[in-house]
Interface confidence: medium
């Protein structure tokens, strides 16, 4: 589930180059890696550089969101002549270098994936010592995290004129379709709100008017699975309250 594409200028996949005598700086990453929430995924990144036989100090860095300025999620440093890249930063302990930077490989493993990890990641290598040089992937690799639906909130809320409405919010990727069922409803898609800005995996469906007492069930479904949750509406007749 990685989609790689040919970069016609270099005949390499997502290869970014910087001209230089002899060998040149370039980085090879796939445009996208897909994995399911909970799994581990490998973000491949290999590079070439113009500094033949460089064995001085180096630092390998991965950042998220945007190149050059995005927050670092992983960083390690290797001393002169050492093949061991000592981890200095691994966000939440979930990032681990698999590649050997001395062999031009910065490939990273991300474990226990969550929907929040669905971002673009950028690899970077820095040389220090006799040679001072650095290079970073500009396009990066997009980590696409998929997940079966999970209902994160279901509730009944008061609305004007002593009526009640129900809200169901679910997350998943692809964003799940929501349906309500309940007394005198049959199966209803109700009013589904599009994923919210900044919350691309969340979908909310509203039942604007609950006209009958009983059990209301929200079902969320996508290609990876389905989930459901229920609320109960019981109004104290003759009073203006409700038990849910």
């Amino acid at each position: 589930f990685v989609r790689t594409k040919i970069d016609t200028t270099e005949n390499l996949l997502n290869t970014e180059v910087h001209s230089s005598p002899a060998q040149r700086w370039s980085m090879q990453v796939p445009p996208e890696v897909s994995a399911e929430a909970g799994d581990a995924a490998v973000l491949p990144c290999t590079f070439t550089h113009p500094h033949r036989h460089y064995d001085g100090p180096l630092t390998a860095i991965w950042r998220a969101g945007e190149p050059y300025a995005g927050p670092q999620v992983f960083r390690c440093a290797a001393a002169r002549g050492s093949e061991l890249c000592q981890t200095a930063l691994s966000l939440h302990g979930r990032f681990r270098l698999l590649g050997n930077p001395r062999r031009n490989d910065l490939s990273l493993r991300v474990e226990r994936l969550a929907l929040a990890d669905d971002r673009r990641y950028f690899c970077r290598v820095e040389f220090a010592g006799d040679v001072h040089d650095r290079y970073e992937s500009r396009h990066g690799v997009r980590l696409h995290v998929t997940a079966a639906p999970r209902i994160v909130n279901i509730s009944v809320l008061p609305s004007p004129a002593h009526a009640f409405r129900a809200l169901c919010t679910a997350e998943g990727e692809p964003p799940p379709a929501l349906a309500w069922s309940g007394p005198a409803l049959g199966n209803s898609l109700a009013a589904v709100r599009s994923p919210r800005e900044g919350h691309g995996h969340l979908v909310t469906a509203e039942l604007p008017a609950l006209t009958h007492d009983g059990r209301y069930t929200c079902t969320a479904a996508n290609s990876l699975g389905r989930s459901e949750a229920s609320v109960y509406l019981f109004r104290f007749h003759g009073a203006s309250g409700a038990s849910t």
Partner: antibody, heavy 123, light 107 residues
Framework: QVQLQESGPGLVKPSETLSLTCTVS????????VHWVRQPPGKGLEWIVL???????TYNSALKSRVTISKDTSKNQVSLKLSSVTAADTAVYYC?????????????????WGQGTLVTVSS | DIQMTQSPSSLSASVGDRVTITCKAS??????LAWYQQKPGKAPKLLIS???SLETGVPSRFSGSGSGTDYTLTISSLQPEDVATYYC?????????FGGGTKVEIK
């Protein structure tokens, strides 16, 4: 020397759960991961899942909804469960060692394989 | 998913012949390619990883080459013990995928 041995029932009924165990020797599951791969009779190889040395998992998404993998490092065993089987799941099932995780450059190759066990799904 | 297409699906050659098997990936795999040998009734055996690196103990008549999407396994001088089915496998992306196999026989 490095060895992997698959075991489990040779016959499973449709809709039931297939359970297989891979017992390893000559290396530690603390340092190496294990893949499961299957091969229907007369056909090619299909990768199922990898459990890394630290217990993390990477699944083939086409099978993930039916697959469970776990390991018991102290017993040198990795187990595979495949639920809701059909005749299409009839195959030789192999476990294979995943080389040491760090710095190997061999993220997903399989350097030693078990001999495989044939599982037939039939009523 | 990255599809791996092997050709030919089968071949027959004489002892001592040079044999070439090709594997084409549907996308670039950056040389993250392995070759396996599977003899009848046996498990696969890793021959080559990284497109070109011969595993320890594998005879030097086996070699791998290629880059980008096109890769080749060559047996420089076919021996009777090389009768087997050969599979390529990419590991640039998950799910890991194998070629359909090439069955090699002796004439």
């Amino acid at each position: 020397q490095v060895q992997l041995q698959e075991s489990g029932p040779g016959l499973v009924k449709p809709s039931e759960t297939l359970s297989l165990t891979c017992t390893v020797s000559g290396f530690s599951l603390s340092n190496y991961g294990v893949h499961w791969v299957r091969q229907p009779p007369g056909k090619g190889l299909e990768w199922i899942v990898l459990i890394w040395s630290d217990g993390s998992t990477t699944y083939n998404s086409a099978l993930k909804s039916r697959v469970t993998i776990s390991k018991d490092t102290s017993k040198n065993q990795v187990s595979l469960k495949l639920s809701s089987v059909t005749a299409a799941d009839t195959a030789v099932y192999y476990c294979a060692r995943h080389p040491y995780d760090d710095y190997s450059g061999y993220y997903y190759t399989m350097d030693y394989w078990g001999q495989g066990t044939l599982v037939t799904v039939s009523s | 998913d990255i599809q791996m297409t092997q050709s030919p699906s089968s071949l027959s050659a004489s002892v001592g012949d040079r044999v070439t098997i090709t594997c084409k990936a549907s996308d670039h795999i950056n040389n993250w390619l392995a070759w396996y040998q599977q003899k009848p009734g046996k498990a696969p055996k890793l021959l080559i990883s990284g497109a070109t690196s011969l595993e320890t103990g594998v005879p030097s008549r086996f070699s791998g080459s290629g880059s980008g999407t096109d890769y080749t396994l060559t047996i420089s001088s076919l021996q009777p013990e090389d009768v087997a089915t050969y599979y390529c496998q990419q590991y640039w992306s998950s799910p890991l995928t194998f070629g359909g196999g090439t069955k090699v026989e002796i004439k």
